[in-house]
């Protein structure tokens, strides 16, 4: 015998108190599949969470984070604070990058500056807390009498520093 509840579509629930009639989900609740015996409570996006998509009778609300925070976890279950460029998030909050390291993002960790000398190059632009160093030509290319036809090597992109 077919379960009468299987005919109840998404957005309704099978109401045992009313002879298994399909009743619409009450306000602030939803059922995303058919044949449900209860509707689930809608997620509320409060505080640092803000509503990205309103709850409907067939789908839960979706949250994201207010400015200054970013989502973590499945379905944005957590909001982690952003830091400024030149900082990293530690267990004790945002802290400036130590000398010799940089972070050009609002999240992630401080990474060591590129060591130009490992590639036989010189430092063209010094690094900062926010930016990696820019490597220039090798010191030999800069010595007097050296040929000047060789163009300088392209700057290495941040993020390729040795770990």
């Amino acid at each position: 015998l077919q379960d009468p509840c299987s005919n109840c579509p998404a957005g309704t629930f099978c109401d045992n108190n009313r002879n298994q009639i399909c009743s619409p989900c009450p306000p602030n609740s939803f059922s995303s599949a058919g044949g449900q015996r209860t509707c689930d409570i809608c997620r509320q996006c409060k505080g640092v969470f803000r509503t990205r998509k309103e709850c409907s009778s067939t789908s839960n609300a979706e949250c994201d984070c207010t400015p200054g925070f970013h989502c973590l976890g499945a379905g944005c279950s957590m909001c982690e604070q952003d830091c400024k460029q030149g900082q990293e998030l530690t267990k004790k909050g945002c802290k400036d990058c130590c000398f010799g390291t940089f972070n050009d993002q609002k999240r992630g960790i401080c990474r060591p500056w590129t060591n130009c000398s490992l590639d036989g190059k010189s430092v063209l632009v010094n690094g900062t807390k926010e930016r990696d160093v820019v490597c220039g030509p090798s010191p030999a290319d800069l010595s007097p009498g050296a040929s000047s036809v060789t163009p300088p090597a392209p700057a290495r992109e941040p993020g390729h520093s040795p770990q």
Partner: nanobody, 124 residues
């Protein structure tokens, strides 16, 4: 697939105690440090406590020091947080988290996997 499943949350009166558990699967549990972090609705994520892979080093946020105790049972792949003398400001979703290496400290934020969390409400 790495999975962390928390349990033990609930509604408790100020001054009360709760013990949270986190069951881990999908990785070699004893090889990684673990943490608890919490998310209060009006605040960003806050680190609570960390424990090394072997369990011999533990660290706590100043706000919970002396009240909360982190521990682990590597034979059961389970992390615990014993919470005593609970206060209204401890109300939050508590998430178990896997760190990226065996060792840990109270500075480097090296978390790569989070559980979905268990809710703790401290209210009279």
């Amino acid at each position: 697939e790495v999975q962390l499943v928390e349990s033990g949350g609930g509604v408790i009166q100020p001054g009360g105690s709760l013990r949270l558990s986190c069951e881990a699967s999908g990785f070699t549990f004893s090889s990684y440090a673990m943490s608890w972090v919490r998310q209060a609705p009006e605040k960003g994520l806050e680190w609570v406590s960390s424990i090394s892979g072997s369990g011999d080093s533990t660290y706590y946020a100043d706000s919970v020091k002396g009240r909360f105790t982190i521990s682990r049972d590597n034979s059961k792949n389970t992390l615990y947080l014993q919470m005593n003398s609970l206060r209204a400001e401890d109300t939050a979703g508590y998430h178990c988290a896997k760190e990226g290496s065996n060792g840990t400290d109270d500075y480097h934020y090296d978390i790569d996997v989070w559980g979905q969390g268990t809710s703790v409400t401290v209210s009279s």
